[in-house]
C-alpha cells in the first residue's frame, strides 16, 4: 500500500485536557497533540477518527509520518502545517477520508521533506491550482513530493461548480512545473471523462500511473513518449472502447511498461485489426488473456486474443439513397 | 456585498420544533463555511453549528447533537437549522455567519433572530 505505515512500537495517547500549544512555540520533546496517538520511535502520530477540524498545532518535531484520516477538516489553509521550527522530518502524510473540501494555495509549504501524500476519499471541489507548488510563479522551487494519490476525490455531481474537475485537477498537477520528480501518481475512481492532453508530458518522473475505475473512452489525444520510466499503467475499469495504432507503438516503445487493461468495454469491429494484432505479440499488457468484447452484441464475451481478421468487421455504410427510413 | 438575513424566530414552548433559515447572498468564493451562533442575555455569542456550502459537511457543537440540524439548500443560497425537543436554555438571539474559515466562519454576519423558549 502506498499510504504511510509505522510499527506498532509504544504510542502515548495524550490527556484530553493537554492545551494545544501556539505553533510558533517549539512543542516539548514528548508532546503530543490532544486526540492523537504518538510514537517517538516510529517517529509517527496518528489523529485518526477524532471529527478534528483543524491541524493540530503542536505536532511533535520528531514526526516522520502523520496520519489525520477520517477527520472533518473541511478546509486546508495556507501553511496548514508550517511551524516553528518546522516539521523538518515529515515524509509521509496520509489525510483521506477527512472531508476535505477545499486545499489552497501553499497548503504544504514548509515540508522540505514531505515525499508521500495522500488526499483519497476527500471531495475536492476546491483544490488551488497552487495547492502542491506552494506558488504562483511560471517556475516553482521543486517539491520533494514522489507519491501523490489522489483517489476518489471527485466530489458529488451536482457540487462541481461547473468546473472541469478533469482540468481543475490538472492544473495542481502542472503549476510552476513543482512535480517533476513525482513517481507515483493515482486518480482512480475520480469520474474523469478525459486526460488533458499536457498532463503526462510534463510530469517525466513517473514510475505508476493508476487511472482505473475513471470513464476515460479514449488515449487518442494522450501521449505516453516521454514516460520512458513509467513501470505500470493501470487502466482497468473504464469506458475504452480501441486503443489506436499511435497509442500501442508508444506503449510498446516504453522500456519497463506493464500495461492493466481489464474490464473496459472493448468494441471488436475493423477498428480492432491493429489492437489485436498488437495483443498477440506484445509482452506489456498484463492478463492480455482476460480482455473480451463488449460489443457489437455478437461478438459479447469473445477473448480478444482468439479473434483473428475475419471476426473484425464494419457493417456497411449505407449510400443516402439506399438507407430506409 | 455579501449580506445575509435570518428568518423563522419566535416564541415557543419547551419541547417544540423550530427551523431557522438564513438567505445568503453577494458571496464570491468558491468554497466557504456557513455557520449557527447564539447569544444569550447576559452571555458571550456561542458556535451553534456550522455547513460547508459546496458538499455539505456538518459540524456541531456538543450541547445540540442529537436534537439541531443544520441543512443548505444550494439553489434557494439558503442555510437551514432545524431545532428539536427545545429547551429553554436555547433562548437566545440566532445568527448566522458565513466566512472561508471552518467550522467558526466569521468573515459577515447577519442581524439576528430571536428565540424565545417558556418552560
Known amino acids: 500500500s502506498s499510504s504511510p505505515t509505522s510499527s506498532a512500537s509504544s504510542f502515548s495517547s495524550s490527556a484530553p485536557f493537554l492545551a494545544s500549544a501556539v505553533s510558533a512555540q517549539p512543542p516539548l520533546p514528548d508532546q503530543c497533540p490532544a486526540l492523537c496517538e504518538c510514537s517517538e520511535a516510529a517517529r509517527t502520530v496518528k489523529c485518526v477518527n477524532r471529527n478534528l477540524t483543524e491541524v493540530p498545532t503542536d505536532l511533535p518535531a520528531y514526526v516522520r509520518n502523520l496520519f489525520l484520516t477520517g477527520n472533518q477538516l473541511a478546509v486546508l489553509p495556507a501553511g496548514a502545517f508550517a511551524r516553528r521550527p518546522p516539521l523538518a522530518e515529515l515524509a509521509a502524510l496520509n489525510l483521506s477520508g477527512s472531508r476535505l473540501d477545499e486545499v489552497r494555495a501553499g497548503a504544504f509549504e514548509h515540508l522540505p521533506s514531505l515525499r508521500q501524500l495522500d488526499l483519497s476519499h476527500n471531495p475536492l471541489a476546491d483544490l488551488s491550482p497552487f495547492a502542491f507548488s506552494g506558488s504562483n510563479a511560471s517556475v516553482s522551487a521543486p517539491s520533494p513530493l514522489v507519491e501523490l494519490i489522489l483517489n476518489h476525490i471527485v466530489p458529488p455531481e451536482d457540487e462541481r461548480q461547473n468546473r472541469s474537475f478533469e482540468g481543475m485537477v490538472v492544473a495542481a498537477l502542472l503549476a510552476g512545473r513543482a512535480l517533476q520528480g513525482l513517481r507515483r501518481l493515482e486518480l482512480a475512481s475520480n469520474h474523469f471523462l478525459y486526460l488533458p492532453r499536457d498532463v503526462l508530458a510534463q510530469l517525466p518522473s513517473l514510475r505508476h500511473l493508476d487511472l482505473s475505475n475513471n470513464s476515460l473512452v479514449s488515449l487518442t489525444y494522450v501521449s505516453f513518449r516521454n514516460l520512458t520510466h513509467l513501470e505500470s499503467l493501470h487502466l482497468e475499469d473504464n469506458a475504452l472502447k480501441v486503443l489506436h495504432n499511435g497509442t500501442l507503438a508508444e506503449l510498446q516503445g516504453l522500456p519497463h511498461i506493464r500495461v492493466f487493461l481489464d474490464n473496459n468495454p472493448w468494441v471488436c469491429d475493423c477498428h480492432m485489426a491493429d489492437m489485436v494484432t498488437w495483443l498477440k505479440e506484445t509482452e506489456v499488457v498484463q492478463g492480455k488473456d482476460r480482455l473480451t468484447c463488449a460489443y457489437p452484441e455478437k461478438m459479447r464475451n469473445r477473448v480478444l486474443l482468439e479473434l483473428n481478421s475475419a471476426d473484425l468487421d464494419c457493417d456497411p455504410i449505407l449510400p443516402p439513397s439506399l438507407q430506409t427510413s | 456585498q455579501v449580506q445575509l438575513q435570518e428568518s423563522g424566530g419566535g416564541l415557543m414552548q419547551a419541547g417544540d420544533s423550530l427551523r431557522l433559515s438564513c438567505v445568503v447572498s453577494?458571496?464570491?468564493?468558491?468554497?466557504?463555511?456557513m455557520a449557527w451562533f447564539r447569544q444569550a442575555p447576559g452571555k458571550e455569542r456561542e458556535f451553534v453549528a456550522a455547513?460547508?456550502?459546496?458538499?455539505?459537511?456538518?459540524y456541531y457543537a456538543d450541547f445540540v447533537k442529537g436534537r439541531f440540524t443544520i441543512s443548505r439548500d444550494y439553489a434557494k443560497k439558503t442555510m437551514y437549522l432545524q431545532m428539536n425537543n427545545l429547551k429553554p436554555e436555547d433562548a437566545a438571539v440566532y445568527y448566522c455567519?458565513?466566512?472561508?474559515?471552518?467550522?467558526?466562519?466569521?468573515?459577515?454576519w447577519g442581524q439576528g433572530t430571536l428565540v424565545t423558549v417558556k418552560p
Open positions: 453577494g458571496v464570491t468564493w468558491n468554497s466557504y463555511t
Open positions: 455547513i460547508r456550502w459546496t458538499v455539505d459537511t456538518t
Open positions: 455567519a458565513v466566512g472561508r474559515k471552518w467550522p467558526k466562519a466569521d468573515d459577515y
